[in-house]
Interface confidence: medium
């Protein structure tokens, strides 16, 4: 397995809505066709898979349809976008990607974003 | 346990068509990319060509470029090679192979071969 | 031709060592691709035999290696016996060719 190098943000605080964006870009070493970019959430030493998507250089990525990410690539670099976030969602949100095809494989992991999510307040009861 | 097994192999004249297919089983077919191999009768393997697991990135030989077509239906779990405008040079037993992604490619599995007969 | 070179034929008696090489160049081996191996005996499919220059699968024998330096690889097989007679291909990915590449193969002969 050949390593690469992947970098993003380390703090991101989501909006009100619950939406949060991060760049993940890699040092692509290869000329990969097809690459494979994993969203990863790491809290209290577990590590869950979000989301993922495989995409063709120069095309969209293409998420699950009820997945909670979406994302566009240009080059080398990835903008994610993760909705529907809760308070209880903060943690490190780990960016893997992997040159799939063609040959060799390379594997990349970025250190991680830390997400804050702070539920908003909920308005007060109007007199209206 | 992985299992490959090509079929559609058989007779055809020189200029003519055929379609090879290969069932899949044992293992997650969408996540690994897929090759055809041939051998020509007493030669050694030539590889023919080579598909991504999405099907999204395809490969050739230069010999069968523009001639052969390599495509997968991951719902069927099959890989095919349209073969067109055949010549007596493409007669081999044709091979289905697996690649490995885990760490890095090679051609892991290989199916029993089909063999292709191009004559008049 | 093959784009990677390997001798036609190798032989040896029963117990003997027995050293097969793979010959490529800058664009598959030199690129820091990996040589793979696999074995072909009479009127079966190849089977992988060493993968990523000297990893061998499960239920291959120890008296079979691998080694890669350069551009060129090798496979060895140690305390020969009658039922390594076959023949033998290296592979490699070649990045100008985008594909798989093979040796022309070594057929091997157990005296």
């Known amino acids: 397995c050949k390593a690469m190098h992947v970098a993003q943000p380390a703090v991101v605080l989501a909006s009100s809505r619950g939406i949060a964006s991060f760049v993940c870009e890699y040092a692509s070493p290869g000329k990969a066709t097809e690459v494979r970019v994993t969203v990863l959430r790491q809290a209290d030493s577990q590590v869950t898979e979000v989301c993922a998507a495989t995409y063709m250089m120069g095309n969209e990525l293409t998420f699950l349809d009820d997945s909670i990410c979406t994302g566009t690539s240009s080059g080398n670099q990835v903008n994610l976008t993760i909705q529907g976030l809760r308070a209880m969602d903060t943690g490190l949100y780990i960016c893997k990607v992997e040159l799939m095809y063609p040959p060799p494989y390379y594997l990349g992991i970025g250190n991680g974003t830390q997400i804050y999510v702070i539920d908003p307040e909920p308005c007060p009861d109007s007199d209206f | 346990e992985v299992q490959l097994l090509e079929s559609g192999g058989g007779l055809v004249q020189p200029g003519g068509s055929l379609r090879l297919s290969c069932a899949a089983s044992?293992?997650?077919?969408?996540?690994?990319?897929m090759n055809w191999v041939r051998q020509a009768p007493g030669k050694g393997l030539e590889w023919v060509s080579a598909?991504?697991?999405?099907?999204?990135?395809?490969y050739y030989a230069d010999s069968v470029k523009g001639r052969f077509t390599i495509s997968r239906d991951n719902s069927k779990n099959t890989l095919y090679l349209q073969m067109n405008s055949l010549r007596a040079e493409d007669t081999a037993v044709y091979y289905c192979?697996?690649?490995?992604?885990?760490?890095?490619?090679?051609?892991?599995?290989w199916g029993q071969g089909t063999l292709v007969t191009v004559s008049s | 031709q093959s784009v990677l070179t390997q001798p036609p034929s190798a032989s040896g008696t029963p117990g003997q060592r027995v050293t097969i090489s793979c010959t490529g160049s800058?664009?598959?081996?030199?690129?820091?691709?990996?040589v793979h191996w696999y074995q072909q005996l009479p009127g079966t499919a190849p089977k992988l035999l060493i993968y990523?220059?000297?990893q061998r699968p499960s239920g291959v024998p120890d008296r079979f290696s691998g080694s890669k330096s350069g551009t060129s690889a090798s496979l060895a097989i140690s305390g020969l016996r009658s039922e390594d007679e076959a023949d033998y291909y290296c592979?490699?990915?070649?990045?100008?060719?985008?594909?798989?590449?093979f040796g022309g193969g070594t057929k091997l002969t157990v005296l």
């Open positions: 800058s664009s598959n081996i030199g690129a820091g691709y990996d």
């Open positions: 598909i991504s697991g999405s099907g999204g990135s395809t």
């Open positions: 592979a490699a990915w070649d990045d100008s060719l985008n594909g798989w590449v």
């Open positions: 990523r220059n000297n």
């Open positions: 044992g293992f997650t077919f969408s996540s690994y990319s």
């Open positions: 192979a697996r690649d490995r992604v885990e760490m890095n490619q090679w051609l892991a599995d």
